[in-house]
Interface confidence: medium
């Protein structure tokens, strides 16, 4: 059994999110991931998901009493869905730090949105799409 | 030249973002996703960085001057980072509008952790590990 | 969405008390764990007491054995007892749960000869 079954139980006791009636008005997460079954689509949504549990976790600093369970499930995480990769965390990290009521990070970001917005599309960076420009200008070049 | 370049460019004049000094002290976007080329690690960054903007165009929704640059932007991200699918965008804003200080929302997230742990890895996932787990049942069943 | 109101505030003369009460104004809500914040002018909101799921309690150092933080038994009310107050003590309070839910208007607190 993962290390972080027994954590989870251990802040669903805390959170007294045991109870059935926990479960009205539908899910938060699992219903939205049910709906995507391609893995890029996934980790858009999967994304959100982690970042909204960071931040969540970063709610408990206060109480010592769980912060065992809050390191373990932080850092399972970390393995899963960051694949132990140090630098993936802390982009990821950065990224969700960003304050967008920061006069500066404001500026930096419209005067990034360009670039940020060629880059988009998966197209935009496969070797697919490298391979068949080389194709394109090499037919051109022998006619 | 795509639609959201010109609005863009607005944008930029507007947030008085074309200056050099914008530019100091590093990027917030570009660095970041010049390090990730794998298609899914490229989709967990991109997707807070597009939740960072809708974020801040939301900041900007009371002025008429920047509304037209502002959605055509936002349409032209949802071409490109969610295909054009309605329903993909709209979980990914269910998502980003949960809020982390609601006692619902927090309970809720906490008796789902367990469950989106599990999902959290791609091999939870993928239809190859399904089948290598088909394979080994026949493997079994034939002994 | 639950609410939190937090009461009992005033004007007091250095080393006078006070009691401050903090409840949910709607729904079951239970304090396992909580804690009163204070945030002075132009200061960073700070915790001030805490109490864990198990009673565990602490202080920041410069409120140490000056004030209490408890709860009733069915956790639904947190207070902050204040004894010796100081001028430095002087903040708008706010109590909160952990980890923390929107946060409710706060009490004012002031210290003054």
């Known amino acids: 059994q993962d290390p972080y079954v027994k954590e989870a139980e251990n802040l669903k006791k805390y959170f007294n999110a045991g109870h059935s009636d926990v479960a009205d008005n539908g899910t938060l997460f699992l219903g939205i991931l049910k709906n995507w079954k391609e893995e890029s689509d996934r980790k858009i949504m999967q994304s959100q998901i982690v970042s909204f549990y960071f931040k969540l976790f970063k709610n408990f600093k206060d109480d010592q009493s769980i912060q065992k369970s809050v390191e373990t499930i932080k850092e399972d995480m970390n393995v899963k869905f960051f694949n132990s990769n140090k630098k993936k965390r802390d982009d990821f990290e950065k990224l969700t730090n960003y304050s967008v009521t920061d006069l500066n990070v404001q500026r930096k970001a419209i005067h990034e949105l360009i670039q940020v917005m060629a880059e988009l599309s998966p197209a935009a960076k496969t070797g697919k799409r490298k391979r068949s420009q080389m194709l394109f200008r090499g037919r051109r070049a022998s006619q | 030249q795509d639609p959201y370049v010109k609005e863009a460019e607005n944008l930029k004049k507007y947030f008085n973002a074309g200056h050099s000094d914008v530019a100091d002290n590093g990027t917030l976007f570009l660095g970041i996703l010049k390090n990730w080329k794998e298609e899914s690690d490229r989709k967990i960054m991109q997707s807070q960085i597009v939740s960072f903007y809708f974020k801040l165009f939301k900041n900007f929704k009371d002025d008429q001057s920047i509304q037209k640059s502002v959605e055509t932007i936002k349409e032209d991200m949802n071409v490109k980072f969610f295909n054009s699918n309605k329903k993909k965008r709209d979980d990914f804003e269910k998502l980003t509008n949960y809020s982390v200080t609601d006692l619902n929302v927090q309970r809720k997230a906490i008796h789902e952790l367990i469950q989106v742990m599990a999902e959290l890895s791609p091999a939870a996932k993928t239809g190859k590990r399904k089948r290598s787990q088909m394979l080994f049942r026949g493997r079994r069943a034939s002994q | 969405q639950v609410q939190l109101q937090e009461s009992g505030g005033g004007l007091v003369q250095p080393g006078e008390s006070l009691r401050l009460s903090c409840a949910a104004s709607?729904?079951?809500?239970?304090?396992?764990?909580g804690g009163w914040y204070r945030q002075a002018p132009g200061k960073q909101r700070e915790l001030v007491a805490f109490?864990?799921?198990?009673?565990?309690?602490r202080y920041i150092d410069s409120v140490k054995g000056r004030f209490t933080i408890s709860r009733d038994n069915a956790k639904t009310t947190v207070y902050l007892q204040m004894n010796s107050l100081q001028p430095e003590d002087t903040a708008v309070y706010y109590c909160?749960?952990?980890?923390?839910?929107?946060w409710g208007q706060g009490t004012q607190v002031t210290v003054s000869s």
């Open positions: 709607r729904g079951i809500f239970r304090f396992n764990a």
């Open positions: 109490i864990g799921v198990d009673n565990t309690t």
């Open positions: 909160n749960k952990v980890p923390y839910i929107d």
